[in-house]
C-alpha cells in the first residue's frame, strides 16, 4: 500500500533534508504538493540542512496481535515505536544494548512519530460471535525534532508520549487515483 | 476535543470558483484525515473527497475530479475545499469532517458548522 | 461508482423498533465496506452512530445498534423516542472511496 516494508528488528533513520525544502511559513505549505494529482505534502523535516549528517533517530519495530474486547486479529500487525534519545548518527549503536547513547548538553533533540498509516485488520471473535473488520492507527515513521527552552506548551504537546498520535503521511504519487484503481489495488492486497 | 468552523456563506456566478475554509481546534490539522461532503438542499449528503491514510494520499469522488482541490495550511490549522468551473447545481452546504484520535482510524466523528455556497446568475 | 440504497422514509411508533438498511449495487455489502450511520436533523450538521458496522460512539444512545442482515448494513432503533425522528445516511467504504446512500427520514409517529 505504498508503505515500506517493516522488518521486525530495530533500525536507524537519517532524515535527508535536501529532497524537500519547507516552503516560507506564509504560504500555504501545499499549495501544490498537497494536491491529488502531486500526492499531497512531503515528509515534514524540522531542523536546517546543517543537521542532516548529525542526528539520527532510531525505530522499533516489533509485531504484535490487535484486540478488540474479546476479538483478535486474525494476522499480528507490525508496530513502530520511536525510540527516546536522537543523537548524531555515529554515535548511535545499529542494534539496542550496544553502544552508548549520547545525551546533548545543548539543544533537546526528540525522536518522534512524523507519520501515521491506517492498516485493515479483521479481527476473530469467540463463541460463534460474528468477526469485525476495523482500521488501526499505526506509526508509519519517526523524526528528530528540536526542542529548545523557547518551546511553547502548544509546540510541546507533540511529546505526550512515545505513541502520542503522528503527522499523517503522504507519499509523492503521480496523479489522483481513481476509485477504480484503489478498490483493485485493495482487493489484490487482502 | 476535536472542533472545526468553517467560513460563511457565498453567493457567486457560475463559471467561477469558491474556496471554502475550515479552521481546525483543538488538535492539530497534521494529524487528522480531512474529508469534504455536500448537501444540496433538500437532498442527500455526498462525498467529495478526502485524505487516505492507507495509501497516504488525497482521494476524490470521480463526480469531482479535475474540479476540486482540497489543501492544508498546518502553519493555521486550517483545510481548505476549492470547487472551480460552478455550475447552479453546485449549490449547496459544504461540510468539512476529520476523524477521531485513537487506536481506531474512525473517519467523519467531528463535523464543521457547513458552508452554504449559493451559485446563481 | 457503486449506488448505496436505503429505505426513503420508514415510520416508527414510540418505544417501537425499526430497522433500516442500506444496500449496494456492488453485491452484498460485509464488514470490508466499514459501514457508518449518521442522524441528521433539520438544520444541523450530520452526526455518526455507528462506525465500522457496529461500532458505536461515546454520543451514540444504548437504543441504537449496527449489523449486517442479508447482505445489507442494517440499523437497529429499539425503543423510538419522539428525539430520534430524522433523517439517516449510511456510508459505506469502497477502498478508500466512501459513497453515501440517499437516507432514510425517520418518522416516530
Known amino acids: 500500500q505504498g508503505w515500506q516494508a517493516f522488518k521486525n528488528d530495530a533500525t536507524e533513520i537519517i532524515p535527508e533534508l535536501g529532497e524537500y525544502p519547507e516552503p516560507p511559513p506564509e504560504l500555504e505549505n501545499n499549495k501544490t504538493m498537497n494536491r491529488a494529482e502531486n500526492g499531497g505534502r512531503p515528509p515534514h523535516h524540522p531542523f536546517e540542512t546543517k543537521d542532516v549528517s548529525e542526528y539520527s533517530c532510531r525505530e522499533l519495530h516489533f509485531t504484535r496481535y490487535v484486540t478488540d474486547g474479546p476479538c483478535r486479529s486474525a494476522k499480528p500487525v507490525t508496530e513502530l515505536v520511536c525510540s527516546g534519545q536522537c543523537g548524531p548518527a555515529r554515535l548511535l549503536p545499529n542494534a539496542i544494548g550496544r553502544g552508548k547513547w549520547w545525551r546533548p548538553s545543548g539543544p533537546d533533540f526528540r525522536c518522534i512519530p512524523d507519520r501515521y498509516r491506517a492498516q485493515r485488520v479483521q479481527l476473530l471473535c469467540p463463541g460463534g460471535e460474528a468477526p469485525r473488520a476495523r482500521k488501526v492507527r499505526l506509526v508509519a515513521s519517526c523524526k528528530c525534532k528540536r526542542l529548545t527552552r523557547f518551546h511553547n506548551q502548544s509546540e510541546l504537546k507533540d511529546f505526550g508520549t512515545e505513541a502520542a498520535r503522528p503527522q499523517k503521511g503522504r507519499k509523492p504519487r503521480p496523479r489522483a487515483r481513481s476509485a477504480k484503481a484503489n478498490q483493485a489495488e485493495l482487493e489484490n492486497a487482502y | 476535543e476535536v472542533q472545526l468552523v468553517q467560513s460563511g456563506a457565498e453567493v457567486k456566478k457560475p463559471g467561477a470558483s469558491v474556496k471554502v475554509s475550515c479552521k481546525v481546534s483543538?488538535?492539530?490539522?497534521?494529524?487528522?484525515?480531512m474529508h469534504w461532503v455536500r448537501q444540496a438542499p433538500g437532498k442527500g449528503l455526498e462525498w467529495m473527497g478526502g485524505?487516505?491514510?492507507?495509501?497516504?494520499?488525497?482521494i476524490y469522488a470521480q463526480k469531482f475530479q479535475g474540479r476540486v482541490t482540497m489543501t492544508e495550511d498546518t502553519s493555521t490549522d486550517t483545510a481548505y475545499m476549492e470547487l472551480s468551473s460552478l455550475r447552479s447545481e453546485d449549490t449547496a452546504v459544504y461540510y468539512c469532517?476529520?476523524?477521531?484520535?485513537?487506536?481506531?482510524?474512525?473517519?467523519?466523528?467531528?463535523w464543521g458548522q457547513g458552508t452554504l455556497v449559493t451559485v446563481s446568475s | 461508482q457503486a449506488v448505496v440504497t436505503q429505505e426513503p422514509s420508514l415510520t416508527v411508533s414510540p418505544g417501537g423498533t425499526v430497522t433500516l438498511t442500506c444496500g449496494s449495487s456492488?453485491?452484498?455489502?460485509?464488514?470490508?465496506?466499514?459501514p457508518y450511520w449518521f442522524q441528521q436533523k433539520p438544520g444541523q450538521a450530520p452526526r455518526t452512530l455507528i462506525s465500522?458496522?457496529?461500532d458505536k460512539h461515546s454520543w451514540t444512545p444504548a437504543r441504537f445498534s449496527g449489523s449486517l442482515l442479508g447482505g445489507k448494513a442494517a440499523l437497529t432503533l429499539s425503543g423510538a423516542q419522539p428525539e430520534d425522528e430524522a433523517e439517516y445516511y449510511c456510508?459505506?467504504?469502497?477502498?478508500?472511496?466512501?459513497?453515501f446512500g440517499g437516507g432514510t427520514k425517520l418518522t416516530v409517529l
Open positions: 469532517a476529520t476523524d477521531t484520535d485513537g487506536y481506531w482510524e474512525k473517519f467523519f466523528q467531528h
Open positions: 483543538g488538535y492539530t490539522l497534521s494529524e487528522l484525515s
Open positions: 485524505f487516505d491514510p492507507e495509501v497516504g494520499e488525497l
Open positions: 456492488t453485491g452484498a455489502v460485509t464488514i470490508d465496506h466499514y
Open positions: 465500522d458496522t457496529d
Open positions: 456510508l459505506l467504504d469502497y477502498g478508500g472511496t466512501f459513497v
